[in-house]
């Protein structure tokens, strides 16, 4: 006999990165017929919703009208059908941004490179932080962590056209409190038709440094060849 129901999906709208004092909605999608949803924050019960009528609703929303550092952290949700509870959802990392200062993002050798060239981003912030985050904007957001006293290096290695995109960086005061974003830097990679062998086969980023793709709304639209989990999961652990 089944002891638990399948885990629900959890995500944040419009985004998991929320500027301070702005609003955000945490969505939890379970099953039709669920009579109760619970939202947990940092392991403790945070909010409860009982949808009516349960047989016509499979998603609930928890509204946060005014984001601040106390609301930033890890959320998960569960739901109940009758007496049977679901497995907990994956963890959603909700981040507050626009805290304190604005870093500077630069790219070496420059914003226009040839496929196969090694590219490094530099994120600099002169105030007290030692963790930096590089974010490639998109339907989902790649997040890469770097460390340094006032500056962090983000080596992308030999790039391909899959690395084209808009990048920003943040200083991080803790895992869930980030600075204002840097000005965006666009990276344009064009193929080197003399040396196509320079381009690596897999244009994704180093697996040990990239966080999970979050908030993808459509499958297969990223240029990157790897497929990513679309649910909000363990971004920064």
């Amino acid at each position: 006999q089944q002891q638990t129901l399948p885990k629900p999906f959890i995500w944040a709208e419009p985004h998991f990165m929320v500027p301070k004092e702005k609003q955000v909605t945490i969505c939890c999608q379970g099953n039709y017929g669920a009579v109760e949803y619970q939202l947990h924050f940092e392991g403790s019960l945070f909010a409860v919703d009982r949808p009516k009528p349960p047989e016509r609703i499979n998603k609930v929303q928890f509204y946060i009208p005014d984001m601040n550092s106390r609301m930033a952290g890890q959320y998960s949700c569960i739901y109940r059908v009758g007496e049977l509870w679901s497995e907990p959802s994956n963890l959603l990392d909700l981040v507050v941004t626009e805290m304190y200062d604005t870093p500077t993002l630069s790219v070496h050798p420059g914003p226009e490179v040839i496929s196969g060239e090694k590219v490094t981003f530099y994120c600099r912030l002169d105030t007290a932080t030692s963790m930096f985050l590089l974010l490639k904007e998109g339907r989902s957001s790649h997040v890469q962590r770097g460390y340094g006293k006032v500056q962090a290096e983000f080596p992308l290695g030999p790039v391909t056209t899959a690395h084209r995109g808009t990048y920003r960086c943040f200083g991080s005061y803790n895992n869930h409190a980030w600075s204002f974003p840097s000005e965006p830097v666009k990276l344009l990679v064009t193929g080197d038709i003399e040396n196509t062998s320079l381009a690596p086969e897999d244009p994704t980023f180093p697996a040990d440094t990239w966080g999970t793709y979050l908030l993808t709304t459509e499958t297969g639209l990223q240029k990157d060849h790897a497929l990513w989990d679309h649910t909000a999961q363990n971004l920064l652990r």
Epitope: P111, E112, K136, E137, G138, T160, T161, A162, R164, G165, T166, P184, K186, L188, T190, G191, D192, I193, T196, A199, K223
Partner: antibody, heavy 122, light 107 residues
């Protein structure tokens, strides 16, 4: 609503120059790349070049080097194509197009202007 | 420059037919290929990007495939409103280049 607005037509004399404009609305051109494409009557599409309006960096097809100059004015959200020493070979429709931008850019043309018909004739 | 060799130049088909257009790049262009439709008197419109992704709002009768040098564009069931010229385009390497176009005419 994203739009790229171009003037409908230009008539110029051989040997003269012309400046074609492409005014964007619904997005900031600084956040993407703007391209120009030529189409001669009953012929295919030819990529002229592109600009990164954020820094003014340009790329051109070798064929249009010296013939075309692409600029952008971010304050008016407008990209320009300047064509010099015009001949009948330059008679064509000129389109501006943007590389897709929806909070970030992707490299395909999702929006095109309606095209400016340039006629070079004495 | 990378040359995109597109074939055929013309297609005369009946409504309901299946149509395939090919584009061959002179060198590998990864999957940086898009397909555009240009109806008479109009600007080109994006149909397919990154070789196989259908753009928002494009009917699912339009599909694309390929990687490297060989690319295919298919209309599974041609309709009267598909009368147009179809172009492939690579933006892997500058100068970016287009195929010469395929004119689709309906009987």
């Amino acid at each position: 609503d994203v739009q790229l607005q171009q003037s409908v037509a230009e008539l110029v004399r051989p040997g003269a120059s012309v400046n074609l404009s492409c005014t964007a609305s619904g997005f900031n051109i600084k956040n993407t790349y703007m391209h120009w494409v030529k189409q001669r009557p009953e012929q295919g599409l030819e990529w002229i070049g592109m600009i990164d309006p954020a820094n003014g960096n340009t790329k051109y097809a070798p064929k249009f080097q010296g013939k075309a100059t692409i600029t952008a004015d971010t304050s008016s959200n407008t990209a320009y194509l300047h064509l010099s020493s015009l001949t009948s070979e330059d008679t064509a429709i000129y389109y501006c197009a943007r590389w897709a931008y929806d909070g970030y850019y992707e490299s395909y043309f999702d929006y095109w202007g309606q095209g400016t018909t340039l006629t070079v004739s004495s | 420059s990378i040359v995109m060799t597109q074939s055929p130049k013309f297609l005369l088909v009946s409504a309901g037919d299946r149509v395939t257009i090919t584009c061959k790049a002179s060198q590998s262009v990864s999957n940086d290929v898009a397909w555009y439709q240009q109806k008479p008197g109009q600007s080109p419109k994006l149909l397919i990007y990154y070789a196989s992704n259908r753009y928002t709002g494009v009917p699912d009768r339009f599909t694309g495939s390929g990687y490297g040098t060989d690319f295919t564009f298919t209309i599974s069931t041609v309709q009267a409103e598909d009368l147009a010229v179809y172009f492939c385009h690579q933006d892997y390497s500058s100068p970016f280049t287009f195929g010469s176009g395929t004119k689709l005419e309906i009987k």
